[in-house]
């Protein structure tokens, strides 16, 4: 027989020769990190038709590392279903908490033992340090001094000194979420006024108000004859500037060979009117108000 | 608080020009909107103009061709430049600080009388 | 234009009558009216803007409303010194236009 067959968990004792006779036995032992369990034998023989009898390392079992429990407000799951050398442990924590250590640890091999990359990690409690005073405003539950996972605060702005009220610009609740951290930034409290939108040959057509504080809309058509240049819709925006710019109306070009610019808003039409049908409180044409602004 | 005063009313014939002047005081006339409206007892109240902070302008298209609204930040003074005057210019004007942004009028001034006559 | 028609075109009150002046709009205009008071000698002065909002300084016996095309000035009780010419403003487009006035005297 020629040499005989090699293993993953298990290696010959002594050398190993080139060539066998027949009826001649070689012997296996288990590999480092592995242990033999019986009853499968361990040796093969050179059989008269020049083939080695049939063996396998099956016996053979790789050393295993202590069994970790899942850590208290957490989860230990193995990777490939054991816990032999090579396996990997992967810590996770259920909601509300964090770890503190190593999220995988691996079954690794020391001389002959089986033991853990590490120390298994901790899941704690997530808690957040209460959320940032904001100026003009205030949020609830101000007297906690430690908040817990999803525990969240509203945040709201003070009455304004002047005629004109603080808006709350950002998010007016925030919670306490993963990493100790919250989930968002704390917003801002201040006056956002934005200027009344004057659109010469042209007029509002929704978004009709004493005052346009942050996040007013306001939208606009042009007087017959006239075209859209910028957009029908405004915002007011925070830093209390319209966005988009008011636009301008244009007059329609009276030349038959030149081709009227377009408005951004509303595609190739020489003039936008928004049916007005779309704008709850606004009065219908047949009332007979719309027509003539100019 | 900007005080904004009037200046440069007169006689003046048909056809003639004239410009009036708006003076701020206590405050820069470059951080306003001014407007400009004349009174007079033919035909009341009129709003000619305004000249915005940007320095951008919206005219009553009834004055446009004749009357023009402009500013000097370095003299933080804003004019109303009159030209073709006809008989019945003739009214007290007023410049006006549009009210923070909004059209309505808060801050009257004393006026300015122009008087035009042969 | 816009145009303001202003009635009536004058009155004569009691002090402690209440007075009651009409602005109507040739047009719809919103809520965006002003009014304005103008003394005997005296510049206009702010008296109410956005139809119904009083300018600060404003006795409360001047109240404003309405909407759309037909607005109206009330003084509750009337008094000596609201004596003079009251004027409505129109600001949903250009240009602003004014009524012709409205004289309140004083029997």
């Known amino acids: 027989c020629e040499a005989p067959p090699t293993f993953e968990a298990m290696e010959l004792i002594g050398k190993p020769k080139p060539y066998y006779r027949v009826g001649e036995r070689v012997d296996y032992k288990c590999k480092k990190g592995y242990f033999y369990i019986p009853p499968l034998a361990t040796h093969t023989i050179c059989d008269r038709n020049h083939t080695w009898l049939p063996v396998s390392d099956e016996g053979c079992y790789r050393e295993m590392c202590p069994h970790i429990r899942d850590p208290l407000n957490g989860e230990a799951i193995l990777a490939n279903g054991s816990y032999e050398f090579g396996a990997e442990l992967h810590f996770i924590c259920n909601e509300g908490y964090y770890l503190i250590g190593k999220d995988i640890l691996y079954c690794e091999l020391k001389d002959t033992v089986a033991i853990w990359s590490g120390k298994p990690p901790l899941c704690e409690k997530i808690l957040c340090t209460p959320p940032p005073k904001i100026k003009n405003g205030k949020h609830t539950f101000s007297e906690v001094e430690v908040f817990e996972y999803l525990d969240a605060v509203t945040y709201s702005c003070d009455p304004a000194p002047g005629p004109d009220p603080f808006s709350l610009i950002g998010e007016s609740m925030i919670y306490c979420g993963n990493n100790s951290t919250w989930s968002h930034a704390a917003p801002e409290c201040k006056v956002v006024k934005c200027r009344f939108p004057v659109v010469e040959n042209g007029k509002q057509i929704s978004g009709f108000g004493k005052k346009f504080y942050y996040k007013a809309t306001v939208m606009f058509e042009c007087d017959k004859g006239y075209y859209l240049n910028g957009s029908d819709k405004i915002v007011c925006e925070s830093n209390s500037t319209w966005d988009p710019p008011v636009p301008k109306c244009l007059k329609v070009s009276t030349s038959p060979t030149t081709k009227s610019p377009t408005s951004s808003a509303s595609g190739p039409r020489p003039t936008y009117k928004p049916p007005v049908s779309n704008y709850p409180g606004y009065p219908k044409p047949d009332e007979g108000i719309l027509n003539n602004l100019d | 608080e900007v005080q904004l005063v009037e200046s440069g009313g007169g006689l003046v014939q048909p056809g003639g020009s004239l410009r009036l002047s708006c003076a701020a005081s206590?405050?820069?006339?470059?951080?306003?909107?001014i407007s400009w409206i004349r009174q007079s007892p033919s035909r009341g109240l009129e709003w000619l103009g305004v000249i915005w902070t940007d320095g951008g302008t919206n005219y009553n298209s009834a004055f446009m061709s004749r009357f023009t609204i402009s500013r000097d930040d370095s003299k933080n003074t804003a004019y109303l430049q009159m030209n073709s005057l006809k008989t019945e210019d003739t009214a007290v004007y007023y410049c006006e600080r549009v009210y923070d942004g909004y059209p309505w009028f808060a801050y009257w001034g004393q006026g300015t009388l122009v008087t035009v006559s042969s | 234009a816009i145009q303001l028609t202003q009635s009536p075109s004058s009155l004569s009150a009691s002090v402690g009558d209440r007075v009651t002046i009409t602005c109507r709009a040739s047009q719809w205009i919103s809520n965006y009216l002003n009014w304005y008071l103008q003394k005997p000698g005296q510049s206009p002065q702010l008296l109410i803007y956005?139809?119904?909002s009083l300018h600060s300084g404003v006795p409360d016996r001047f109240s404003g409303s309405g909407s759309g095309t037909d607005f109206t000035l009330k003084i509750s009780r009337v008094e000596a010194e609201d004596v003079g010419v009251y004027y409505c403003?129109?600001?949903?487009?250009?240009?602003?236009?004014f009524g012709q006035g409205t004289k309140v005297e004083i029997k």
């Open positions: 956005y139809t119904s």
């Open positions: 403003q129109q600001y949903i487009k250009l240009p602003w236009t």
């Open positions: 206590g405050g820069s006339v470059s951080s306003y909107d």
